[in-house]
């Protein structure tokens, strides 16, 4: 209720002679700060004096000073919330009740705390899980109801007196709720730990023994078994007897059932610790073990491998791989059941013994077609020789051999002919299923392995075929040697290297790219007129009249081919210049006179220059010179000059006559 002081601290604290005690404590006074504090040992209330009697272990004065004899007991609290105490060292006679007498300005309170001090260090307490099973991780806990800042301790784990390798986790608590030291150890027990003693040892800071607690481990586990066999090597021949005995070396709890297994399968009606096998057969070869069960589960012994020996059985051959590709590697494996394993093998190819082959495997690194056939083998061990089995067939596959392309036509072949070719081969495995031809073309294949080229091209130089099964084998190309008329005939200017000017020496060449046969004739023509029969057409001094359209022809025994028409252009300076006058060479004054400079030039005239009868230059540069209004004094001879990139040309003089108008004559 609200009339009480509120305290929080452990109810009882434990320690031993010479150790210390740390009392975590908090409080809340009814009013104001703490003014007086006395720590009593076994306080008793005296009704007469209305005070508490008892041994005073600690007393605080108003000025906060503490008598020197009180150094063993320390008040570590404050005036409003902390009441923590320390007694160091603690003595046996400190056991009993501690009374905390608190006084504020108006209120008083007595708080009681139990202290249990033993003569010597008390043992820790080991806590185990309710059940421990082999190989299952468990946590072992060692708890000690003691912790004090002034007295360090340690907890150590031992198994059969030997420190345990596993790392323990130690924790301490010094709170108003609890005071303890705890060590936790994670541990996976094995069946062999059953019955062993685990100790938790309390030691001081120097590792000196203080006390301990021990427990015996009860590790539940499946039965642990040993198997014994007669004969001890477990190797027998057919008809011999074998005895196997099962012994239980440990079981917790006790075992309940026994059984025997062969190759992992339970043997019926075999539920005793002894297994007797009489007159064994090879089928009884295998791995035997006994199985004994308890409430935890079944336990199995190690396996005993019983070998019943016999002579090899009829052999079979396994081929890796068939069909085999020519040039690849092949491995033959002779398979024959026998015990002991065969020590010697005899190999046969198509019924004939293969010399020097005595191993279980035969390896042929590079298979050839003649390796095909039936392979069989015989196995042999110390008990005898087996029989030869049916054997296995090796199929050797290879590309078609000796492929050739054959021309069926009579020779020579001319451009435009129809050509038939056939593709032949010597042998093939598997059979040829298709043919390929190079180069590809839109050609007919009238039947398998036959190619028909309609209208053969001049450039169909060579043809090759391939016969194909799983692979294609190409024949060497055959030359068609197609004959054709000259091709790509063209006119080429050899000289001059630049543009042709009037008067230049000019050579034209008739070029062609190819001709078969090589022997050719040339013809030159201009405007349908034959000019020459050489490969070159030469002009010593070209004139503008030689300009025009030229063609050349090249022919051989197959036909003739013409070039495209080639235009010969001759550049020349302006020529044949003359001045024409409009409306005529006689004009009335005041009218307009137009003079035109006419010329022949290649390239055309770029500009003109006009001159009068005194060779004076007039400021006009176009083809026409317009005088308006024309005056009588403009009468006279005029001439023009034309200029192009080749040069200049001039006209002869042309006379313009300007006559007086009737008005002028009338005025005179």
């Amino acid at each position: 209720d609200s009339s009480k002081w509120v305290f929080e601290h452990p109810e009882t604290l434990y320690a031993w002679e010479g150790a210390c005690v740390w009392i975590p404590c908090t409080y809340r006074a009814l009013d104001g700060d703490l003014e007086s504090f006395i720590l009593f040992h076994n306080p008793e209330y005296n009704k007469n004096t209305s005070k508490f009697d008892g041994t005073r272990l600690y007393e605080s004065t108003k000025d906060g000073k503490v008598p020197s004899e009180q150094k063993r007991v320390q008040f570590l609290g404050d005036k409003n919330k902390n009441c923590t105490l320390s007694i160091h060292p603690v003595h046996l006679n400190d056991s009993g009740q501690l009374g905390l007498r608190m006084e504020s300005k108006t209120e008083k309170w007595m708080e009681r705390i139990h202290l249990n001090v033993s003569e010597r260090p008390f043992p820790p307490h080991i806590q185990l899980p309710p059940e421990i099973q082999e190989s299952q991780e468990v946590t072992l806990t060692c708890l000690l109801n003691f912790s004090c800042y002034g007295y360090p301790i340690q907890l150590q784990w031992l198994l059969e007196g030997v420190p345990m390798r596993q790392a323990a986790v130690t924790s301490t608590s010094l709170t108003i709720k609890s005071v303890f030291t705890r060590s936790e150890l994670k541990f996976s027990p094995q069946w062999s730990h059953h019955g062993k003693i685990v100790t938790c040892q309390l030691q001081d800071a120097d590792g000196k023994f203080l006390s301990n607690d021990t427990v015996q481990l009860n590790v539940k586990h499946t039965p642990k078994l040993e198997i014994k066999v007669t004969p001890s090597d477990a190797i027998v021949r057919e008809g011999d007897s074998v005895t196997m005995t099962c012994e239980v070396s440990s079981s917790n709890p006790e075992y309940t059932t026994v059984s025997w297994l062969k190759d992992g399968t339970s043997l019926k009606k075999q539920n005793t610790f002894t297994l007797n096998l009489r007159e064994v057969t090879k089928d009884q070869s295998g791995k035997y073990c006994c199985q004994v069960s308890n409430d935890v589960g079944p336990g199995r012994s190690e396996e005993v491998f019983l070998q019943v020996q016999y002579a090899p059985e009829p052999s079979t051959v396994q081929i890796l791989h068939s069909p085999a590709v020519e040039g690849s590697q092949v491995e033959f494996l002779c398979m024959s059941l026998a015990n002991p394993l065969p020590t010697n093998y005899t190999w046969y190819h198509n019924g004939k013994e293969m010399q020097g082959r005595t191993e279980e495997k035969v390896h042929i690194p590079k298979i050839l077609p003649w390796h095909a056939g039936t392979y069989s083998c015989v196995a042999e061990n110390i008990l005898g020789t087996g029989q030869r089995g049916p054997g296995a067939e090796l199929d050797v596959q290879y590309p078609p051999k000796k492929v050739t392309t054959v021309i069926q036509n009579p020779m020579p072949i001319r451009e435009g002919d129809t050509v038939t070719l056939s593709c032949n081969y010597n042998s093939s495995n598997p059979s040829v299923t298709r043919y390929e031809w190079k180069p590809h073309g839109a050609w007919e294949e009238p039947s398998l392995g036959v190619l028909k080229i309609q209208n053969v091209g001049w450039d169909n130089t060579t043809i090759a075929c391939a016969a194909c099964n799983s692979w294609c084998s190409w024949a060497s190309p055959v030359a068609l040697n197609v004959q054709y008329a000259p091709r790509d005939v063209r006119v080429r200017k050899i000289k001059p290297l630049s543009e042709i000017h009037s008067g230049n020496s000019v050579s034209l060449q008739c070029d062609f790219s190819s001709s078969h046969p090589k022997e050719v004739q040339f013809f030159w023509e201009k405007n349908g007129r034959l000019l020459g029969k050489e490969s070159q057409l030469n002009f010593d001094s070209i004139s503008p009249e030689d300009a025009g359209s030229y063609s050349c022809w090249v022919n051989n025994s197959i036909g003739q081919t013409a070039s495209k028409a080639w235009t010969l252009e001759v550049l020349y300076a302006p020529r044949r210049l003359r001045v024409s006058m409009s409306p005529g060479d006689q004009v009335m004054e005041g009218k307009s006179a137009t003079l035109t400079c006419e010329s022949d030039a290649n390239p055309p005239v770029s500009h003109y220059t006009w001159f009068d009868w005194n060779n004076q230059s007039l400021p006009y540069h176009s083809q026409k010179l317009r005088l308006e209004p024309v005056k009588v004094q403009h009468s006279g001879a005029y001439w023009c000059q034309g200029t192009n990139s080749v040069g200049k040309g001039r006209s002869p003089l042309s006379t313009l006559t300007v006559y007086y108008s009737p008005e002028t004559i009338g005025r005179r």
Epitope: H607, N615, Q616, S617, L618, P619, R626, Q633, Q641
Partner: antibody, heavy 128, light 107 residues
Framework: QVQLQQSGPGLVQPSQTLSLTCVIS??????????WNWIRQSPSRGLEWLGR?????????DYAVSVKSRITINPDTSKNQFSLQLNSVTPEDTAVYYC???????????????????WGQGTTVTVS | DIQLTQSPSSLSTSVGDRVTITCRAS??????LNWYQQKPGKAPKLLIY???NLQSGVPSRFSGSGSGTDFTLTISSLQPEDFATYFC?????????FGQGTRLEIK
């Protein structure tokens, strides 16, 4: 160094005659390697060539079609000048008028071409 | 008449820029083409004559090229005093004609 000095009124009444003179110094109006030109400039028409006079054995004139019926360009050898007369003017003839020498001529053996290298200072003529 | 078309009609540029102005003739005029510079209130000044010849006293940053119908005036590195209007003119035949002009202004 060749110079051209223009003179003439800046204001002309409509339908009246515009008269401008260009005095040449440093060259001769009778030179056989030059032509003497009148050019005008207005915001609406830009630079517009009006005509020219030049001497090559005889005197010659060339006129722009747009003013052919109204224009006269005369050389005056005694004063070494040339003049422009433009009759029947209208406000459309308002412009800055320039005289200029154009180097284009000479003889067959000694020909020159160097463009309009010398210009007068310009006369602003307003018709109103 | 021979028409001369200049492009562009105006151009905003900065000092140091390279500038090219073109002039196209409506028919072939050989090389009878001249270039002029005009500043406000002043008469035109000859820069280039006969398409590619630099007039005496004109800075070498000005150059001209072309023949036939297509002509170019180039200013290799624009100076502050080059902001003006530029005209082309043909003397191939009468009437003598001018281009409409290209105005260069500071960006």
């Amino acid at each position: 160094q060749v110079q051209l000095q223009q003179s003439g009124p800046g204001l002309v009444q409509p339908s009246q005659t515009l008269s401008l003179t260009c005095v040449i110094s440093g060259d001769s109006v009778s030179s056989n390697s030059a032509t003497w030109n009148w050019i005008r400039q207005s915001p609406s028409r830009g630079l517009e060539w009006l005509g020219r006079t030049y001497y090559r054995s005889k005197w010659y004139n060339d006129y722009a079609v747009s003013v052919k019926s109204r224009i006269t360009i005369n050389p005056d050898t005694s004063k070494n000048q040339f003049s422009l007369q433009l009759n029947s003017v209208t406000p459309e003839d308002t412009a800055v008028y320039y005289c200029a020498r154009d180097g284009d001529g000479g003889s067959y053996y000694d020909y020159y071409y160097y463009g309009m290298d010398v210009w007068g200072q310009g006369t602003t003529v307003t018709v109103s | 008449d021979i028409q001369l078309t200049q492009s562009p009609s105006s151009l905003s540029t900065s000092v140091g820029d390279r500038v090219t102005i073109t002039c196209r003739a409506s028919q072939s005029i050989s090389t009878y083409l001249n270039w002029y510079q005009q500043k406000p209130g002043k008469a035109p000044k000859l820069l280039i004559y006969a398409a590619s010849n630099l007039q005496s006293g004109v800075p070498s940053r000005f150059s001209g090229s072309g023949s036939g119908t297509d002509f170019t005036l180039t200013i290799s590195s624009l100076q502050p005093e080059d902001f003006a209007t530029y005209f082309c003119q043909q003397s191939y035949t009468t009437p003598i004609t001018f281009g409409q002009g290209t105005r260069l202004e500071i960006k």
